[in-house]
Interface confidence: medium
């Protein structure tokens, strides 16, 4: 893929070399859609996506999730997966605008944080917002998950899986109206059990860009267009979390 600099991406920004984001990344399209045998976010290996096999159940609500949507859809109509992460409890109403000052960072103080961890994004997300997560993958890790949430919807689910049918894969998706959509999967896997990591998510007008350990990994087109309503980032999985913060670049 062609490479381009952050200056190109943010031309005219007055900040040609913002701190903390890789100087260049591959101009990659969003990951491919789901395919037969793909698993759902939070589901354990072996769960298939809609359309994979005749009669296979599609993704549904996660049973037992706290918050406004604990339940499963109508019996016999929308069977859900057997397991998965619960939604994070709702936070307060997001503000109508996403006016973050170009200073910061804001977020959790450095030091060990309890996982799962919720990072409030009080004005939602806005283009040029950079979220940085630092931590260490636990030994024998199974999964990591970042959930950019709008109430009980998940606008962007970023889910590295360390052992899905003996493969390592990153699955991205969106949950709307209590159900998961079409997966986008990425086989490049920069995480290692027992090793530290840095995940950075840059919000762009049309997509999220994700970089890991200072290298561009993927981009995910916005399916939830009302960015100002994405008011919380949930961080979960098999990690020791050191810090989670955001700033404007």
């Amino acid at each position: 893929a062609d490479n381009f600099s952050l200056h190109d991406a943010l031309s005219g920004s007055g900040n040609p070399n913002p701190q903390g984001w890789p100087g260049a990344w591959g101009n990659q399209p969003a990951g491919a859609g789901g395919y037969p045998g793909a698993s759902y976010p939070g589901a354990y290996p072996g769960q298939a996506p809609p359309g994979a096999y005749p009669g296979q159940a599609p993704p549904g609500a996660y049973p037992g999730a706290p918050g406004a949507y604990p339940g499963a859809p109508a019996p016999g109509v929308y069977p859900g997966p057997p397991s998965g992460p619960g939604a994070y409890p709702s936070s307060g109403q997001p503000s109508a605008t996403g006016a973050y000052p170009a200073t910061g960072p804001y977020g959790a103080p450095a030091g060990p944080l309890i996982v799962p961890y919720n990072l409030p994004l009080p004005g939602g997300v806005v283009p040029r917002m950079l979220i940085t997560i630092l931590g260490t993958v636990k030994p024998n890790a199974n999964r990591i998950a970042l959930d950019f949430q709008r109430g009980n919807d998940v606008a962007f689910h970023f889910n590295p899986r360390f052992n899905e049918n003996n493969r390592r894969v990153i699955v991205c998706n969106t949950k709307l109206d209590n159900n998961w959509g079409r997966e986008e999967r990425q086989s490049v896997f920069p995480f290692e059990s027992g090793k530290p990591f840095k995940i950075q998510v840059l919000v762009e007008p049309d997509h999220f860009k994700v970089a890991v350990n200072d290298a561009h990994l993927l981009q995910y087109n916005h399916r939830v267009k009302k960015l100002n309503e994405i008011s919380k980032l949930g961080i979960s999985g098999d990690i020791d979390l050191t810090s989670a913060s955001y700033t404007m670049i």
Partner: antibody, heavy 117, light 110 residues
Framework: EVQLVESGGGLVKPGGSLRLSCAAS????????MNWVRQAPGKGLEWVSS????????YYADSVKGRFTISRDNAKNSLYLQMNSLRAEDTAVYYC??????????WGRGTLVTVSS | QSALTQPASVSGSPGQSITISCTGT?????????VAWYQQHPGKAPKLMIY???YRPSGVSNRFSGSKSGNTASLTISGLQAEDEADYYC??????????FGGGTKLEIK
């Protein structure tokens, strides 16, 4: 049995108001996002409005924005649509519909709203 | 919030197969959002026939199938029967948290 029953329709003059209600039963109402969908006589379906389970997020079609207000009372298992400044083109059967990302799986029988002088 | 595009009518004979198309844009049908299909008999409420592009709710005949490619979704009814005569609507979620319907297709059984 999962059921939605609409009420409150009727004849109203242009510029008038009407409040539709929908009584839900047979499922945990607060767990579901709900919608109003309408159908003008002899015409197709038109999505009108939706409301999330907690009432935190509310959306409207451009054609009714500023005139209609959707609300719900989870304690009463009820959905409402307050319709103000009614126009002739709002004449339709209004359906209360339970919603999911995959599809709208439960529909009421509908209530007819007629706007005419 | 413009409607998805469906043919106004299609017809077929008993036992035949027909396909109804539903064309949208990258903001709805083609934008990783799921398409549903509804059947509506005269004077009745719509009934969900297909969800998640290609899934049938329990109780819906396996003669009904759905698919999607790019910005176009399709509903296929095989082995047409007299009771299949009805109006059919497609619908998609959009990124702006709205829903959009197709204009509807009248299926006539000859």
């Amino acid at each position: 049995e999962v059921q939605l029953v609409e009420s409150g329709g009727g004849l109203v003059k242009p510029g008038g108001s009407l409040r539709l209600s929908c009584a839900a039963s047979g499922f945990t109402f607060s767990n579901y996002n709900m919608n109003w969908v309408r159908q003008a006589p002899g015409k197709g379906l038109e999505w009108v409005s939706s409301i999330y389970g907690s009432s935190r997020y509310i959306y409207y079609a451009d054609s009714v924005k500023g005139r209609f207000t959707i609300s719900r009372d989870n304690a009463k298992n009820s959905l409402y649509l307050q319709m103000n400044s009614l126009r002739a083109e709002d004449t339709a059967v209004y359906y209360c519909v339970r919603s999911s990302y995959g599809g709208m799986d439960v529909w009421g029988r509908g209530t007819l709203v007629t706007v005419s002088s | 919030q413009s409607a998805l595009t469906q043919p106004a009518s299609v017809s077929g004979s008993p036992g035949q197969s027909i396909t109804i198309s539903c064309t949208g844009t990258s903001s709805d049908v083609g934008g990783s959002y799921n398409v549903a299909w509804y059947q509506q008999h005269p004077g009745k409420a719509p009934k969900l026939m297909i969800y998640y592009d290609s899934y049938r709710p329990s109780g819906v005949s396996n003669r009904f199938s759905g698919s999607k490619s790019g910005n176009t979704a399709s509903l296929t009814i095989s082995g047409l029967q007299a009771e299949d005569e009805a109006d059919y609507y497609c619908s998609s979620y959009t990124g702006y948290s709205t829903r959009v319907f197709g204009g509807g297709t009248k299926l006539e059984i000859k």
